[in-house]
């Protein structure tokens, strides 16, 4: 009796079960009564990543330098190519097809995780007793000048944005 | 049913291409396979390559460099030339559908001589 | 490349004996599947090989009981318990198990 189901690495067809083609290699023929499936490796920049029954392997994706992408690991036949962002740029999604320049944190916002080829600058407020007044993907909010340690006094307020100004302290008559 | 027929010159030169015609009907070349096999006078049998149905090729490994398989499957036709022939590629000349082992072409027989 | 050896090169029987013919391969012909794709063929002169035997053991539509074959691995058998005179031809052994396919040397089946 000609089988429902098949076992794992294998697939119906014609009311017999044929073995799936390896990682790396392509469905040329299914199986017959005088012969196993017939499979062949898939062509150089091509790859499957899968036990298949595939016809056809899949290309390489190609990291495109003009869209800022350069390729993170080379493709094998079994896998396919990672690309990755040139310097300075990070990818727009998952699959990283394009790149996009890494965000600058505006004044009163610092760098909480610098930006890699994958993930973009992720910016945080700075809180009070911070403060960043440049546009920045590197700089972390800096902690306000502590004037008492130089001897000085709070001439004015720092703010996000602002450092705060110190003075000389009052002379006492 | 399946049916297979060689055709093609019966004499060769030496250093010449041998070229051949398998003609199949009843089954489909975009679906299946076509082997080409030969059998020198009086000796046993060599499997000389396939096309399968996508057109990808496999070659036996002692004729590769001079043996070329294609098809054209609205002909239903696929085609044999073997380049540089001698005379030890004299031989009957078969072809056989993939899956039809049961069903072989009546042969052809090529002689290489001047 | 798989080489398949055939023995004995001709075999000199009556008609009503039984035939035993051998193949030998020279590597395993078990497929990682399991299957084992040896076939025997009968070939008579001027004419085109009929297939007989398929995945070592199992007779091809209309050919009579008396041809079985049997074996595993890397020997194989195939086994006419009767020889009919129309049974007195040149016979194959052929492996699809791996590309290159092979074919044995034949071994010759004549009457005595």
């Known amino acids: 009796e000609p089988p429902t189901a098949c076992r794992e690495k294998q697939y119906l067809i014609n009311s017999q079960c044929c073995s799936l083609c390896q990682p790396g290699q392509k469905l040329v023929s299914d199986c017959t009564e005088f012969t196993e499936t017939e499979c062949l490796p898939c062509g150089e920049s091509e790859f499957l990543d899968t036990w298949n029954r595939e016809t056809r392997c899949h290309q390489h994706k190609y990291c495109d330098p003009n869209l800022g992408l350069r390729v993170q690991q080379k493709g094998t036949s079994e896998t396919d190519t990672i690309c990755t962002c040139e310097e300075g740029l990070h990818c727009t999604s998952e699959s990283c097809e394009s790149c996009v320049p890494h965000r600058s944190c505006l004044p009163g916002f610092g760098v909480k995780q610098i930006a890699t080829g994958v993930s973009d600058t992720i910016c945080e407020p700075c809180p009070v007793g911070f403060f960043s007044n440049v546009s920045s993907a590197f700089e972390k909010c800096r902690p306000w000048t502590s004037c008492e340690t130089k001897d000085l006094v709070v001439q004015q307020a720092g703010t996000n944005k602002t450092d705060v100004v110190c003075g000389p302290q009052d002379r006492q008559r | 049913q399946v049916q297979l027929q060689e055709s093609g010159p019966g004499l060769v030169k030496p250093s010449e291409t041998l070229s051949l015609t398998c003609t199949v009907s009843?089954?489909?070349?975009?679906?299946?396979?076509v082997h080409w096999i030969r059998q020198p006078p009086g000796k046993g049998l060599e499997w000389i390559g396939v096309?399968?149905?996508?057109?990808?090729?496999n070659y036996n490994p002692s004729l590769k460099s001079r043996v070329t398989i294609s098809k054209d499957n609205s002909k239903n036709q696929v085609f044999l030339k073997l380049s540089s022939v001698t005379a030890a590629d004299t031989a009957v000349y078969y072809c056989?559908?993939?899956?039809?082992?049961?069903?072989w072409g009546q042969g052809t027989l090529v002689t290489v001589s001047s | 490349e798989i080489v398949l050896t055939q023995s004995p090169g001709t075999l000199s029987l009556s008609p009503g004996e039984r035939a035993t013919l051998s193949c030998r391969s020279s590597?395993?012909?078990?497929?990682?599947?399991?299957?084992?794709?040896l076939q025997w063929y009968q070939q008579k002169p001027g004419q085109a090989p009929r297939l007989l035997i398929y995945?070592?053991?199992n007779r091809f539509s209309g050919i009579p009981d008396r041809f079985s074959g049997s074996g595993s691995g890397t020997d194989f058998t195939l086994t006419i318990s009767r020889l009919e005179p129309e049974d007195f031809a040149v016979y194959y052994c052929?492996?699809?198990?791996?590309?290159?396919?092979?074919f044995g040397q034949g071994t010759k089946v004549e009457i005595k």
């Open positions: 056989l559908g993939h899956g039809h082992f049961d069903v």
């Open positions: 009843g089954f489909s070349l975009p679906t299946s396979g």
């Open positions: 096309i399968w149905a996508g057109g990808d090729t």
């Open positions: 590597q395993s012909l078990v497929h990682s599947s399991g299957n084992t794709y």
């Open positions: 995945k070592v053991s």
């Open positions: 052929s492996q699809t198990t791996h590309v290159p396919w092979t």
